[in-house]
């Protein structure tokens, strides 16, 4: 039943019926279930095992109606022990000879069958009236997870018999279910830390410790929330949890004061073009507060006066930014600064970077196109465009010529070296219009194309000629 202790002898007189394993004759040698010890087991309760109120098996056959009720004997109802101790408890049952079919005893905890790793032994004590069975269960070095309600089950004549439970209550040092966590806080700003520990035994009382000194003189009941009014420097906090079994100390957590970040380091140029520079950096220490964004500062290095600084803002990650809209073939000084919620870091060391030469900014001028009928070629001439220093060194020209006639369209291009200002290209189609455009090329790239110059290629010897430097679109002069 549900009493905590073994039944009193007075109650035993009223309730007891049938043989008890604890009172088997001394000369009865037990026989063991497979894999069990052959050592004599102690009786369930030092000679005082007691039957439960029987829940008689409800069997239906005529023969089985004559069978006496069978039930597990009563055993101790409640065991309290400390963590890491060993514990043994048992179930016992007396099966009269009239019962033919019995299955092994299984152990259950909180409604789930205990399988595998648990250590249980079943032993059988036969006599002339039947057999007494003792199932011993042992746990070495109990843990909190062994807390629970244990009981036995057995099938007798296809009927499931269940014992009364044995409550196992494991007590130990307080066990933390919530420990304080490291936080980063603003200087002189209040914050909370939480600590929660449980038994059993309850209650669990909490002391807070800051830099090895107790914060609260009187303990607080778990869970405890410590409100720290503010800090000016890093501190280490922990909590002590006390119960009747002793004391457990939580991990120590660092509470850091948020500061401005350290400046970024290792600023590098990953790539340069005529008008952009790709810069990377390694963020400095974040000052215990996530970096929010970074600022790339750019100034022209060649200026004698302290020229204006261009500022480009970007997210803190990735640590990469392409500075655009720069002049070609120019030198720049670049530095990076990053910000967290407290403020901006100092700037990184300045580094020098250069843009490459640009593409030409103007097209070749005074373009003329002649048809040389005898050689069946177009003779193209132009004037070299005015190229600035930052546009780079002229390396050649690209000539685009498009041929159109009824039902035919052909788009071609040629590259010529910078030597001279003329070129010849073979006629591709007769009775067609040819449109010519020319662009200058430097190492920085290709410049804009000139306005188109059109020439009509006759079927025979007639020729329309259209000289043009920079004519209006579609303008055609005949000759």
């Amino acid at each position: 039943g549900g009493t905590a202790e073994k039944w009193e002898e007075t109650e035993l007189d009223q309730l007891f019926s049938g043989p008890l394993p604890g009172r088997l004759p001394v000369n009865h040698r037990p026989f063991s279930a497979p894999h069990s010890s052959r050592d004599q087991l102690p009786p369930p309760q030092t000679g005082r095992s007691h039957p439960a109120h029987t829940a008689a098996p409800q069997v239906t056959s005529t023969a089985s109606k004559l069978l006496p009720p069978v039930a597990f004997n009563h055993t101790i109802g409640h065991i309290v022990l400390s963590e890491h101790k060993n514990v043994k408890f048992n179930c016992s049952i007396n099966i009269p000879n009239t019962y033919q079919e019995t299955a092994g005893i299984s152990w259950w905890k909180d409604g789930k069958e205990l399988l595998g790793a648990h250590h249980s032994i079943t032993q059988f004590y036969p006599d002339e009236e039947g057999v007494s069975i003792i199932a011993l269960f042992s746990i070495a070095s109990v843990q909190r997870s062994d807390n629970g309600s244990y009981f036995c089950k057995m099938k007798v004549n296809n009927r499931e018999i269940v014992s009364d439970p044995i409550y196992v209550e494991v007590q130990g040092l307080p066990y933390f279910i919530k420990q304080p966590e490291s936080v980063n806080v603003t200087r002189n700003t209040a914050f909370n830390l939480t600590c929660q520990a449980v038994g059993p035994p309850e209650p669990v009382n909490i002391f807070w410790v800051q830099n090895s000194s107790r914060v609260n003189e009187k303990p607080e009941r778990s869970p405890s929330v410590l409100t720290v009014p503010g800090l000016t420097e890093t501190a280490v906090f922990s909590c002590e949890a006390h119960n009747d079994k002793g004391l457990t100390v939580s991990k120590g957590v660092h509470i850091n004061i948020k500061v401005i970040p350290s400046p970024p380091t290792e600023v590098h140029i990953l790539n340069s073009t005529a008008h952009s520079i790709l810069v990377s950096w390694v963020p400095g220490f974040d000052g215990y507060s996530p970096l929010q964004n970074c600022s790339i500062q750019v100034k022209e290095a060649d200026r004698l006066s302290n020229g204006s600084v261009m500022v480009f803002n970007t997210s803190a990650s990735p640590h990469l930014y392409e500075i655009q809209q720069l002049q070609a073939l120019a030198n720049y000084s670049i530095a990076v600064s990053c910000r967290n919620e407290i403020g901006w870091s100092a700037v990184s060391p300045w580094i020098l970077a250069s843009t490459t030469e640009g593409a030409p900014s103007v097209a070749p001028l005074n373009i003329t196109v002649f048809l040389n009928e005898s050689n069946n070629i177009l003779d193209i001439r132009w004037t070299k465009p005015p190229i600035k220093r930052q546009d780079g060194e002229l390396v050649g020209y690209r000539i685009s010529h498009v041929w159109e006639s009824a039902g035919t369209y052909k788009e071609l291009s040629e590259e010529v070296s910078q030597n001279g200002s003329w070129a010849q290209i073979p006629v591709q189609i007769h009775n067609a219009t040819c449109t010519v455009r020319i662009a200058a090329i430097t190492k920085g790239g290709i410049g804009p194309f000139s306005e188109p110059v059109n020439i009509i290629i006759p079927e025979h010897s007639k020729v329309d000629y259209a000289p043009s430097s920079t004519p209006a679109p579609g303008n055609t002069d005949s000759m």
């Epitope: 549900g2 905890k109 909180d110 409604g111 018999i161 009364d164 439970p165 409550y167 209550e169």
Partner: antibody
Framework: QVQLQQSGPELVKPGASVKISCKAS????????IHWVKQRPGQGLEWIGW????????KYNENFRGKATLTADTSSSTAYMQLSSLTSEDSAVYYC???????????WGQGTSVTVSS | DAVMTQTPLSLPVSLGDQASISCRSS???????????LHWYLQKPGQSPQLLIY???NRFSGVLDRFSGSGSGTDFTLQISRVEAEDLGVYFC?????????FGSGTKLEIK
């Protein structure tokens, strides 16, 4: 979390019977004793008995033997108490409670009021 | 049966005062397994009883440390160090060492 939900109030005539229920949740119903307690208006508490739902075993306070019958339905995790041959003395609030691992009645139902009146 | 005698029946207190309730059993409540199964409950008006102290001196989960229990054998005491308004109600002791389980008659804690 452990909860015991009892059935609603009952108004019954003398000599009749009543069956009140206690639905358990939040733990293994078949593993813990359910106890029943009587409280008459403005009076103390009286222990009626227990049932272990895992095997149906019961134990009664002799004062309630023949008056109360305890049963349990494991499929619905519900314990029942039937009170028979009701008289005005049976008018009371009846509580179910779980006997927890600490061997105390740790969680209680909200109580069921039974009024016996003609 | 183990008869539980609880005193006083009524305990008028001022908020912030200490309160002490006694429970005496007609037989020892120490079980043969070494534990003493004497528990204390509070029943607030219109509510179910709630467990405060189990096995003489262990506070149940969530119970404030104003509540403490002591005693052994047959004599037990519940103490409330600083009474607050939320502590008002009827306090019962309960023994579960012997069948039938028996309750004390109750002590009503009320404001002076």
């Amino acid at each position: 979390q452990v909860q015991l939900q009892q059935s609603g109030p009952e108004l019954v005539k003398p000599g009749a019977s009543v069956k009140i229920s206690c639905k358990a949740s939040g733990y293994s119903f078949t593993s813990y004793y359910i106890h029943w307690v009587k409280q008459r208006p403005g009076q103390g508490l009286e222990w009626i008995g227990w049932i272990f739902p895992g095997n149906g075993n019961t134990k009664y306070n002799e004062n309630f033997r023949g008056k109360a019958t305890l049963t349990a339905d494991t499929s619905s995790s519900t314990a029942y108490m039937q009170l028979s041959s009701l008289t005005s003395e049976d008018s009371a609030v009846y509580y179910c409670a779980r006997l927890g691992l600490i061997y105390a009645l740790d969680y209680w139902g909200q109580g069921t009021s039974v009024t016996v009146s003609s | 049966d183990a008869v539980m005698t609880q005193t006083p029946l009524s305990l008028p207190v001022s908020l912030g005062d200490q309160a002490s309730i006694s429970c005496r059993s007609s037989q020892s409540l120490e079980s043969s397994n070494g534990n003493t199964y004497l528990h204390w409950y509070l029943q607030k008006p219109g509510q179910s009883p709630q467990l405060l102290i189990y096995r003489v001196s262990n506070r149940f989960s969530g119970v404030l440390d104003r509540f403490s229990g002591s005693g052994s054998g047959t004599d037990f005491t519940l103490q409330i160090s600083r009474v607050e308004a939320e502590d008002l109600g009827v306090y019962f002791c309960l023994q579960v060492t012997h069948v039938p389980f028996t309750f004390g008659s109750g002590t009503k804690l009320e404001i002076k």
